[in-house]
């Protein structure tokens, strides 16, 4: 059985489109499961992995490896 584009699995009922944009950064494995690109995490692979050590409470990142501090906090790790 050959599945339509972006459909995977037995019965071709698993849907996955590789993407690399605001809404997700992932490839699809042979079963149609999302595999996040390096630096991204979460079920949709749209949450950047911040600089190692970045404060989860006072820092965040839009891009992998960044660590942007909340107002009132500073330092390499926003701690």
């Amino acid at each position: 059985v050959t599945c339509d584009d972006y459909y995977y699995g037995f019965g071709c009922n698993k849907f996955c489109r590789p993407r690399d944009d605001f809404f997700g950064h992932y490839a699809c494995d042979q079963n149609g499961n999302k595999t996040c690109m390096e630096g991204w995490m979460g079920p949709e692979c749209n949450r950047a992995i911040c600089r190692q050590g970045c404060s989860p409470k006072h820092g965040s990142c839009k891009l992998p490896g960044d660590c942007r501090c909340q107002y009132g906090w500073q330092g390499l790790y926003c701690d």
Epitope: R17, D21, F22, E44, A48, S60
Partner: antibody, heavy 119, light 107 residues
Framework: QVQLVQSGAELKKPGSSVKVSCKAS????????MHWVRQAPGQGLEWMGA????????AYNQKFKGRVTLTADKSTSTAYMELSSLRSEDTAVYYC????????????WGQGTLVTVSS | DIQMTQSPSSLSASVGDRVTITCRAS??????LAWYQQKPGKAPKLLIY???TLADDVPSRFSGSGSGTDYTLTISSLQPEDFATYYC?????????FGGGTKLEIK
């Protein structure tokens, strides 16, 4: 279960701004972007933009760029939509909405917030 | 931007009828299409996603089909609770635009 609870109705003057909130519960707030959709009275649905609460990244419909600002507060799992330079055509119900778990489109919706712009 | 053209804009039908609503995209959206049902004063409810997959708790009388630029929502046997407005929406690339809606009324 996933719940999105929005702030109450607003009456605004032309030229002013409005800020609508959307409190999320029942899932990890930072795992999914929050989208905003509006619907003018008797009209169709219009996608305004989205925010990724984890890092604050945003995507906007160009139609609203410059007038709409999306923000999120991770500590309270609340997303906000601020629309400025209001005009009568902005009178609408504003919805926050979230994708489902397997790349669904908008599976979860807030109850809507009516914003009326009138002098 | 991809535009979505939905037809008809309104439709009168009777309980038990088979009803078809169509949606045409201005570009290939590769099955990245959803259908919603909306009742007055309520938020839209997801019916179908990825063109043909039924969302949770949606009755099997609803079905979706199509590919490329042309898509269809079919209700095989209308029930009283199905009278509402239906919208298609693509989610291939931002902005995720909606069709203009189809108001389904009782004949």
């Amino acid at each position: 279960q996933v719940q999105l609870v929005q702030s109450g109705a607003e009456l605004k003057k032309p030229g002013s701004s409005v800020k609508v909130s959307c409190k999320a519960s029942g899932y990890t707030f930072t795992d999914y972007e929050m989208h905003w959709v509006r619907q003018a009275p008797g009209q169709g649905l219009e996608w305004m933009g989205a925010i990724q609460p984890g890092g604050g990244g945003t995507a906007y419909n160009q139609k609203f760029k410059g007038r709409v600002t999306l923000t999120a507060d991770k500590s309270t799992s609340t997303a906000y939509m601020e629309l400025s330079s209001l005009r009568s055509e902005d009178t609408a119900v504003y919805y926050c909405t979230r994708r489902g778990y397997d790349d669904y489109p908008f599976a979860y919706w807030g109850q809507g917030t009516l914003v009326t712009v009138s002098s | 931007d991809i535009q979505m053209t939905q037809s008809p804009s309104s439709l009168s039908a009777s309980v038990g009828d088979r009803v078809t609503i169509t949606c045409r995209a201005s570009g290939n959206i590769h099955n990245y299409l959803a259908w919603y049902q909306q009742k007055p004063g309520k938020a839209p409810k997801l019916l179908i996603y990825n063109a043909k997959t039924l969302a949770d708790d949606v009755p099997s009388r609803f079905s979706g089909s199509g590919s490329g630029t042309d898509y269809t929502l079919t209700i095989s046997s209308l029930q009283p609770e199905d009278f509402a407005t239906y919208y298609c929406q693509h989610f291939w690339s931002a902005p995720w635009t909606f069709g203009g809606g189809t108001k389904l009324e009782i004949k």
